[in-house]
């Protein structure tokens, strides 16, 4: 009679994470009697998953039936399985002793190894906004994926980039991996509508990649240029005067006007024109009283545009051109929220 | 621990036989339980075991198809049940116990390791 | 099958060995039984190979290796003269026993 064996058919075994894993093992005899336990690992530091005799493990089920009497498979299921369950497990067969049980035989080990997907990406860009023309930050992150090996690209408006660092942690061994990138990104004034995309790739995902996105509207911000210009009159003793704002982002602006320097009205910007670029447009205009200036007027539009050091345009207005009303002082009548008088 | 046999005496061929086992000190729960028996002048013979899951039972050839083993936890009671007696089932027959305290169904119904031994229960098959 | 002796003597104070032989190593567990005489209950001296239940005099020990396994009496004595049987199993037979040894004590 040959003396028993503990087989372990499978070398490895490959499970999805949240799937149930089959451990497989058999004896080749009935005698020593004596309980099967599982492990996960060896030596002393090994993890007891399943035994036989005692205990509760409401994660694993036997494959058969362990009452029946000539059973000789101790195989066992492990339910929602993660990545913390890889390993290798071994099928050890005890004999019964006194007052212990004695440990007999044990299986080759099998390996279980955990696929578990990533994590969305997570994309981040930089804390503060930044101008065209200057490279900013972006990362990505995901988590809790293994086997280790994953792929990952960046993409700006479909196009792929190549200024990026990538590292897997941890470099050795592990249940579970993460992922972490960064790319420099170019803006430019075009970029209000533009999207940065972290695409992560594992064999996990079935050729579907996992991506992230951030909108580059949230890091840009494109500076207004100005442009201060007299109407023509209105009226033989008014002139408009109008500050064009364009090309901006974002929508928080500012705008102040000066009559030599000093403070005539002050507006937030609120009903705005949309370029299809995702810059705004808006114009402010003051219509001005020339009776009321014996000289001639410096006219200033000064902005502050998302709590940036102001900018401005100045215009001269030349009075002695126009007729007036000695010793006038008659207010002329608004005609917009964003009219004003200068007197 | 003690084991306590009974039921043997003078028995006709062809009538059927029951043997009883108290076991007291343990819980017959725990442990896989046996018959064994000692015709005259030979050694001893496994006749018939139990496990200590009550489910799993096993018989020597001499007696399989004949013999039924059971038990009965409430009554800590062991019986053989012997139908068909011939004159070879004579013999003295003893209850046994294994030392192994079992909780598990793959002890299944092995009788390896005895520890304690009723006195014996004499049975005479005869015409 | 399991083989013993069918007879050893010794005086007392000897030490005597009694052998038990199984056909294969698949006999993980031996034990003696001493019967004083036929039909009286048997007595287990050593289970577990080696191990001795309460009640039995230290003179007797236990040993296996292999398919063989040996019962000593270390210094005999008179009281311990009876047939002394060897048990074990395998995996169809849940109990199995030799024919028995005679031990004499001169």
């Known amino acids: 009679e040959e003396e028993l064996q503990v087989i372990q058919p499978d070398k490895s075994v490959l499970v999805a994470a949240g799937e149930t894993a089959t451990l497989r093992c058999t004896a080749t005899s009935l005698i020593p009697v004596g309980p099967i336990q599982w492990f996960r690992g060896a030596g002393p530091g090994r993890e007891l998953i399943y035994n036989q005799k005692e205990g509760h493990f409401p994660r694993v089920t036997t494959v058969s039936d362990l009452t029946k009497r000539n059973n000789m498979d101790f195989s066992i299921r492990i339910g929602n399985i993660t990545p913390a369950d890889a390993g290798t497990y071994y099928c050890v067969k005890f004999r019964k002793g006194s007052p212990d049980d004695v440990e007999f035989k044990s299986g080759a080990g099998t390996e279980l190894s955990v696929r578990a997907k990533p994590s969305a990406p997570v994309v981040s860009g930089p804390a503060a906004r930044a101008t065209p023309q200057h490279t900013v930050s972006f990362t990505c992150e995901s988590h809790g994926f293994s086997p280790r090996d994953i792929t990952l690209k960046w993409f700006k408006n479909g196009n792929e980039l190549s200024d990026f660092q990538t590292n897997v942690d941890p470099v050795g061994e592990s249940v579970s991996y993460s992922i972490h990138s960064t790319a420099k990104v170019v803006l430019t004034r075009e970029d209000v509508h533009s999207q940065v995309i972290c695409e992560v790739a594992h064999v996990t995902l079935q050729g579907d990649p996992l991506r992230g996105t951030a909108n580059l509207s949230e890091t840009i911000r494109v500076p207004p240029t100005l442009e201060v210009t007299q109407q023509p009159v209105r009226a033989e003793n008014q002139v408009n005067v109008t500050c064009q704002v364009r090309k901006f982002y974002p929508q928080r602006l500012q705008l102040t006007w000066l009559e030599n320097g000093n403070v005539s009205r002050t507006e937030t910007a609120s009903t705005v024109t949309e370029n299809k670029d995702g810059t705004y447009n808006w114009m402010s205009w003051l219509l001005v009283n020339v009776s009321a200036h014996r000289d001639d007027v410096k006219l200033t539009c000064q902005v502050e545009h998302d709590g940036q050091p102001a900018v401005s345009k100045s215009h001269d207005l030349k009075v002695s051109a126009h007729p007036k009303e000695q010793g006038s002082n008659t207010a002329a009548e608004n005609t917009g929220s964003n009219e004003r008088n200068i007197y | 621990v003690t084991l306590d046999e009974s039921g043997g005496g003078l028995q006709t061929p062809g009538r059927a036989l029951s043997l009883v086992c108290r076991g007291s000190g343990f819980s017959i729960s725990s442990y896989n339980m046996g018959w064994v028996r000692q015709a005259p002048g030979k050694g001893l013979e496994f006749i018939a075991s139990?496990?200590?899951?009550?489910?799993?039972?096993h018989y020597a050839p001499a007696v399989k198809g004949r013999a039924t083993i059971t038990r009965d936890v409430g009554q800590s009671t062991v019986r053989l049940q012997l139908n068909n007696l011939r004159a070879e089932d004579t013999g003295t027959y003893f209850c046994?116990?294994?030392?192994?305290?079992?909780?598990?169904?793959?002890?299944?119904?092995?009788?390896?390791?005895?520890?304690?031994w009723g006195h014996g229960t004499e049975v005479i098959v005869s015409s | 099958a399991l083989t013993q002796p069918s007879s050893v003597s010794a005086n007392p104070g000897e030490t005597v060995k009694i052998t038990c032989s199984g056909d294969n190593s698949a006999h993980y567990y031996y034990g003696w039984y001493q019967q004083k005489s036929p039909g009286s209950a048997p007595v287990t001296v050593i289970?577990?190979?080696?191990k001795r239940p309460s009640g039995i005099p230290s003179r007797f020990s236990g040993s296996a290796s292999g398919s063989t396994a040996t019962l000593i009496i270390t210094g005999v004595q008179v009281e311990d003269e009876a047939v002394y049987f060897c048990?074990?199993?395998?995996?169809?037979?849940?109990?199995?026993f030799g024919a028995g040894t005679t031990l004499t004590v001169l």
């Open positions: 046994a116990k294994d030392a192994y305290q079992c909780s598990y169904a793959t002890c299944n119904d092995y009788l390896d390791t005895i520890d304690a």
């Open positions: 139990i496990g200590s899951d009550g489910s799993s039972t």
């Open positions: 289970y577990y190979n080696d």
């Open positions: 048990g074990s199993a395998d995996s169809s037979n849940p109990a199995i």
